[in-house]
Interface confidence: low
């Protein structure tokens, strides 16, 4: 009898069972060792099992696959390629599995994959072709709709001698494969900047989460093409002010909600346009929570309470009067 439950409850597969049949081709509905399976829910959970590789004998029915809390280290090309293919796999969660390398074509042969979560893995080496699967200038469109990449930044001493932002963006843009992506989460990655071309090439985005990074400015970022964008999370960054160009672009997005809490806003003369805009706009959620961080005399003032007389800039001293 099959070790897979046909009820909605999960059944576990004993390790000895997997080893006993390892010489034979796996049964299509077999549950891998150290996993729990529910055929009724089309779900397989191999969670917190210290697995070092993706199980080979995943059941063909799987739609939702949880491989969280393991020790996978490397995701090779075709890590999920099977015969027959895992044609129904739609949601794949690999968070917290100590992945430090995702190779080109790691997610190939997953025609229905719509949600992918790689969060909380120290990705020192994310191939530019991890999501596109090929190095062609235009790849076959990826079926991905949601890509969750929160806290994938490796420790500083493990980073390659290249921009981490650049590595991630290269993977997002390769082959224009992710044109259908609707949700992209890049929170908690120490991003210092957002490469200017990234958003222009993800025109289907509905939700973009860049919270808890180190973004200082959005001056060179364009949101103009993101006409479907519904939520933009910029909380907990290092933003000092939003300039007119950015304000106008955000205001022009028909469905947008922007989240700006916990940024160190500098309330000097350069803030006047943003304060005026905040008083007018409906796009900023919780706008009455935004407070000044600098200069010291303005600290904790609520931006919406400010008037133009509050927002002054100290005159620039001639060089002879400046002190270091």
């Amino acid at each position: 009898s099959s070790p897979t439950s046909s009820a909605s409850s999960f059944s576990s597969s004993a390790p000895f069972l997997a080893s006993a049949v390892s010489a034979q081709p796996p049964l299509p509905d077999q549950c891998p060792a150290l996993c729990e399976c529910s055929e009724a829910a089309r779900t397989v959970k191999c969670v917190n099992r210290n697995l070092t590789e993706v199980p080979t004998d995943l059941p063909a029915y799987v739609r939702n696959l949880f491989l969280t809390g393991n020790q996978l280290a490397v995701l090779p090309a075709g890590a999920f390629a099977r015969r027959p293919p895992l044609a129904e796999l739609a949601a794949l969660n690999l968070s917290g599995s100590r992945l430090d390398e995702v190779r080109a074509g790691a997610f190939e042969h997953l025609p229905s994959l719509r949600q992918l979560d790689l969060s909380h893995n120290p990705l020192a080496d994310l191939s530019p072709f991890a999501f596109s699967g090929s190095n062609a200038s235009v790849s076959a469109p990826s079926p991905l709709v949601e890509l969750i990449l929160n806290h994938i930044v490796p420790p500083e001493d493990e980073r390659q001698n290249r921009s981490f932002e650049g590595m991630v963006v290269a993977a997002l843009l390769a082959g224009r494969a992710l044109q259908g992506l609707r949700r992209l989460e890049l929170a908690s990655n120490h991003f210092l900047y957002l490469p200017r071309d990234v958003l222009a090439q993800l025109p289907s985005l509905r939700h973009l989460d860049l919270s808890n990074n180190s973004l200082v400015s959005l001056t060179y970022v364009s949101f103009r093409n993101l006409t479907h964008l519904e939520s933009l999370h910029l909380e907990d960054n290092a933003l000092k002010v939003l300039h007119n160009g950015t304000l106008a672009e955000l205001q022009g997005l028909p469905h947008i909600r922007v989240f700006l809490d916990n940024n160190p806003w500098v309330c000097d003369c350069h803030m006047a346009d943003m304060v005026t805009w905040l008083k007018e706009t409906e796009v900023v959620q919780g706008k009455d929570r935004l407070t000044c961080a600098y200069p010291e005399k303005m600290r904790n003032r609520v931006l919406l309470e400010l008037n133009s007389a509050d927002l002054d800039c100290d005159p620039i001293l001639p060089p002879s009067l400046q002190t270091s």
Epitope: K279, E280, T281, E282, D288, R289, R299, N300, R301, V302, L304, E305, L306, N307, D310
Partner: antibody, heavy 117, light 111 residues
Framework: EVQLQESGAEMVRPGASVKLSCKAS????????MHWVKQRPGQGLEWIGK????????QYNQKFKDKATLTVDKSSITVYMELNSLTSEDSAVYYC??????????WGQGTLVTVSA | DIVMTQSPASLAVSLGQRATISCRAS??????????MHWYQQKPGQSPKLLIT???NLESGVPARFSGSGSGTDFTLNIHPVEEEDIATYYC?????????FGGGTKLEIK
């Protein structure tokens, strides 16, 4: 349930000082500003100032800048207002009120201060 | 400072009728989308209670017979139908800039 418990009524001499307290409960104390509002008998409301419960940063109505001093004790989740150089003009009910960012969401019961020789 | 002027100073209304209280700011406290005007109710011997934020947003728990409207410099609080428990003084408050200021209050009585 949010509650703001203010100290009892005070009768003080002209020229003296008084320190009022406001003890908070029922919410995350450090997440909100605490405001103080003055109401003279039979009259309207005047905003005195506010204090950030998390870092003691204050902001005052210029009219009260030399009259009131706001402080906070996070360990006892209590905010204080000291009024100095009291005159009969300072006789009033003083309310602490928890901020709702741009309004006063919750109010204490008020402390009556009477300045009389 | 922005000066808030309420009228009338007192108002007597029959039960079940409409009470209308006006508040005028000495400068605009609105943008095209938001009005930074809020209303409070203070019953005799009690602390003020928040009724309405942003000129027209009813606080939870406040009866639907209360409504607020207006923009720019002119704002109105309506109570309809007036009930016995509405006997109180009503205050408007702006939060356009520091210092926040209140109107002088309107005392509502029953005829």
């Amino acid at each position: 349930e949010v509650q703001l418990q203010e100290s009892g009524a005070e009768m003080v001499r002209p020229g003296a000082s008084v320190k009022l307290s406001c003890k908070a409960s029922g919410y995350t104390f450090t997440s909100y500003w605490m405001h103080w509002v003055k109401q003279r008998p039979g009259q309207g409301l005047e905003w005195i100032g506010k204090i950030d419960s998390s870092d003691s940063k204050t902001q005052y109505n210029q009219k009260f800048k030399d009259k009131a001093t706001l402080t906070v004790d996070k360990s006892s989740i209590t905010v204080y207002m000291e009024l100095n150089s009291l005159t009969s003009e300072d006789s009033a009910v003083y309310y602490c009120a928890r901020g709702g960012y741009l309004w006063f969401a919750y109010w204490g019961q008020g402390t009556l201060v009477t300045v009389s020789a | 400072d922005i000066v808030m002027t309420q009228s009338p100073a007192s108002l007597a209304v029959s039960l079940g009728q409409r009470a209308t209280i006006s508040c005028r700011a000495s400068q605009s406290v609105s943008t095209s989308t938001y009005s930074y005007m809020h209303w409070y109710q203070q019953k005799p011997g009690q602390s003020p209670k928040l009724l309405i934020t942003y000129a027209s947003n009813l606080e939870s728990g406040v009866p639907a017979r209360f409504s607020g409207s207006g923009s720019g410099t002119d704002f109105t609080l309506n109570i309809h139908p007036v009930e016995e428990e509405d006997i109180a003084t009503y205050y408007c408050q702006h939060s356009w800039e520091i210092p926040w200021t209140f109107g002088g209050g309107t005392k509502l009585e029953i005829k």
